[in-house]
Interface confidence: low
């Protein structure tokens, strides 16, 4: 089977504070079975910013429909983006298990937020 | 309001164990990072441990081996178990919440964990 | 690891003055430095992160600045709750994070 390679084409992404952020994320295999979580941050500060098991993420919302067995389109977008979302965003699969395991992450995605246009 | 309320220290005997609980309210607990900070007396602070939302861990070198940080998101509570305490890790033990970017924006009032014979 | 100087040990001043307090990091730490304040018998609180950006209901007498390896923690007429214990701590490696060993400012 194919190795998995997670794919965040855009190093970075700069947005108007109150628009939506389009976060980029596919990867390139279904295997390992198990989820994609995105995260802000790295190491004990990273925070979870969306699980495809857990919620609700009320200001995150799927571009595709994840749900579907052989989806391979992760990205999500961030509504109502403000300066506290800036950061660099991780894509990262996890291995299913009790619990989970940490598999393989995408490179990132740095977010900027732009002053709202008076 | 965030709060933070640990509990579980005392005196114990070099060699011996305890369990510090760190119980979490105010927040969505299972988004954050936690840690904990100790201070002995008179020092200043010192970063033990910490744990990302999804359970990632994280140690000093000087505790590696002998303490382990864990978490109940469903309890929205954070652990530290200490063994083969020194009296070196006498302090007052913080739990923190870890904000976006590594600093503590939030902290508890601390426990004493005194280590002596 | 980073290791961070903090400087000078004790400060004695008076209510009123202004106060300067320095954080030496032994590295470039990209102006990740937070810095708290702690008084006796309480938890640290945060005053300032990323070098310069206050936390939330931190007064306009507390500034901090910096960049590269040297950072200071201002406090523009010191009010007598502002006596305390000052530490920084760098937050831009987490393996470990450190703090600085703390700067003491009391009642002259």
């Known amino acids: 089977e194919e190795e998995l390679q997670i794919i965040q084409p855009d190093k970075s992404v700069s947005v108007a504070a109150g628009e939506s952020a389009i976060l980029h994320c596919t990867i390139t295999s279904l295997f390992p079975v198990g989820p994609i979580q995105w995260f802000r941050g790295a190491g004990p500060a990273r925070v979870l910013i969306y699980n495809q098991r857990q919620g609700p993420f009320p200001r995150v919302t799927t571009v595709s429909e994840t749900t579907k067995r052989e989806n391979m389109d992760f990205s999500i977008s961030i509504s109502n983006i403000t300066p506290a979302d800036a950061g660099t965003y991780y894509c990262i699969k996890f291995r299913k298990g009790s619990p989970d395991t940490e598999f393989k992450s995408g490179a990132g995605t740095e977010l900027s937020v732009r002053a709202k246009p008076s | 309001d965030v709060q933070l309320v640990e509990s579980g220290g005392g005196l114990v005997q070099p060699g011996g164990s305890l369990r510090l609980s760190c119980t979490a309210s105010?927040?969505?607990?299972?988004?954050?990072?936690m840690s904990w900070v100790r201070q002995a007396p008179g020092e200043g602070l010192e970063w033990v441990s910490a744990?990302?939302?999804?359970?990632?861990?994280y140690y000093t070198d000087s505790v590696k081996g002998r303490f382990t940080i864990s978490r109940d998101n469903s309890k929205n509570t954070l652990y530290l178990q200490m063994n083969s305490l020194r009296a070196e890790d006498t302090a007052i033990y913080y739990c923190?919440?870890?904000?976006?970017?590594?600093?503590?924006?939030?902290w508890g009032l601390g426990t004493l964990v005194t280590v002596s014979s | 690891e980073i290791v961070l100087t903090q400087s000078p040990g004790t400060l004695s001043v008076s209510p009123g003055e202004r106060v300067t307090l320095t954080c030496r990091a032994s590295?470039?730490?990209?102006?990740?430095i937070a810095w708290y304040q702690q008084k006796p018998g309480q938890a640290p609180r945060l005053l300032i992160y990323?070098?310069?950006s206050r936390a939330t209901g931190i007064p306009g007498r507390f500034s901090g600045s910096g960049s590269g390896t040297e950072f200071t923690l201002t406090i523009t007429s010191l009010q007598s709750e502002d006596f305390a214990v000052y530490y920084c701590?760098?937050?831009?490696?987490?393996?470990?994070?450190?703090f600085g060993g703390g700067t003491k400012v009391e009642i002259k």
């Open positions: 923190a919440k870890v904000t976006w970017n590594n600093f503590f924006d939030y």
């Open positions: 105010g927040f969505t607990f299972r988004n954050y990072g």
């Open positions: 744990s990302s939302g999804s359970g990632s861990t």
């Open positions: 590295q470039g730490i990209a102006g990740k």
């Open positions: 990323d070098a310069s």
């Open positions: 701590q760098q937050h831009y490696d987490w393996s470990p994070l450190t």
